[in-house]
């Protein structure tokens, strides 16, 4: 029998390489049974996760899972960093693993590093 706890399906140490100026949707896959929990996104600043209050978010519902989406329209260079989603469920706070966005500045898109380069040389992303 499936657990009726809320579960947030962000992989541990997941990473995305994205281009500044493009739109991007960061998904938090949420499994729940009856009532949809209240979900929020935050951005890590050291050990603190700062809640993203005034950002555009939406829900996408599918048959077995729902997605709480943080919209980047467009992606900006300072969107680089790690994000986490959290769900409030029966007075419990459930936190996802963090997921990291590596933003490449559109100015350097012609010499844009590959995913492999970005994974092994993340300092390329901060120019």
């Amino acid at each position: 029998k499936e657990s009726c706890d809320v579960q947030l399906y962000i992989k541990r140490q997941s990473e995305h390489s994205i281009l500044a100026g493009d739109p991007f949707e960061l998904e938090c896959p949420v499994k729940y049974c009856a009532n949809r929990p209240h979900v929020t996104w935050c951005k890590l600043n050291g050990t603190t996760c700062v809640k993203l209050e005034d950002r555009q978010t939406s829900w996408k519902e599918e048959k077995n899972i729902s997605f709480f989406i943080l919209h980047f329209e467009p992606v900006l260079p300072n969107d680089n960093g790690s994000y986490r989603c959290s769900a409030n469920f029966q007075s419990n706070l459930i936190e996802s693993h963090s997921t990291t966005l590596y933003v490449t500045d559109v100015k350097s898109a012609s010499e844009r590093p590959s995913k492999d380069e970005m994974a092994s040389r993340p300092w390329l992303l901060y120019r």
Epitope: K11, S14, E15, K115
Partner: antibody, heavy 119, light 112 residues
């Protein structure tokens, strides 16, 4: 039950390239990370790198950067390891493995593929 | 890179007797999520490695409870309270906290 099926043994010439494959059953690889490990005869284990099949994002041990390329095809639930400019140092058993990306609840290894480098 | 150091290199044990393997890491393996991603594998002769223990002390399904993992930070131990013939092989610790992932050099368990 999660299982991995690796491609057969390879005999390759020095300087050539080879592409190994690893097909998962019992799991959608989008929910996992897949990684490759090298084991030379009578030696220990060396982590080559891993891929997130959901978005193709890879991580490598720097010593395999340029030597190894890991890719994944979610339509066939398969990961690949390409090795280039082969030398005798690359002769080894290459294992692929898959683990649950969310909770680490499983970690399953394939049977390994033997790569022999000889002219 | 995180260096994983295992001891001893070889362990010769009589069936029914206990065995203990040490694994030390050059950096703490405590992750920012509060978990420690330290795994133990067993590679039996002629076979591929198989995970026995993850998150320091959690046993994989089907692994007998004579195996126990313990430790924190940089110091970890695998214990077998009564060695059986099927336990022979090479045991590896490896860390899943930092990139690149790294393995210990292995400990060969022989049956006396």
């Amino acid at each position: 039950e999660v299982q991995l099926q690796q491609s057969g043994a390879e005999l390759v010439k020095p300087g050539a390239s080879v592409k190994l494959s690893c097909t998962a059953s019992g799991v959608n690889i989008k929910d996992t990370y897949m990684y490759w490990v090298k084991q030379r005869p009578e030696q220990g284990l060396e982590w080559i790198g891993r891929i997130d099949p959901a978005n193709g994002y890879t991580r490598y041990d720097p010593k395999f950067q340029g030597k190894a390329t890991i890719t994944a095809d979610t339509s066939s639930n398969t990961a690949h390891l390409q090795l280039s400019s082969l030398t005798s140092e690359d002769a080894a058993v290459y294992y692929c493995a898959v683990y649950d990306g969310y909770y680490e609840s499983f970690d399953v290894w394939g049977a390994g593929t033997t790569v022999t480098v000889s002219s | 890179d995180v260096v994983m150091t295992q001891a001893p290199l070889t362990l010769s044990v009589t069936i029914g007797q206990p065995a203990s393997i040490s694994c030390k890491s050059s950096q703490s393996l405590l992750d920012s999520d509060g978990k420690t991603y330290l795994n133990w594998l067993l590679q039996r002769p002629g076979q591929s490695p198989k995970r026995l223990i993850y998150l320091v002390s959690k046993l994989d399904s089907g692994v007998p409870d004579r195996f126990t993992g313990s430790g924190s930070g940089t110091d970890f131990t695998l214990k077998i309270n009564r060695v059986e013939a099927e336990d022979l092989g090479v045991y590896y610790c490896w860390q899943g906290t930092l990139f690149p992932r790294t393995f210990g050099g292995g400990t060969k368990l022989e049956i006396k």
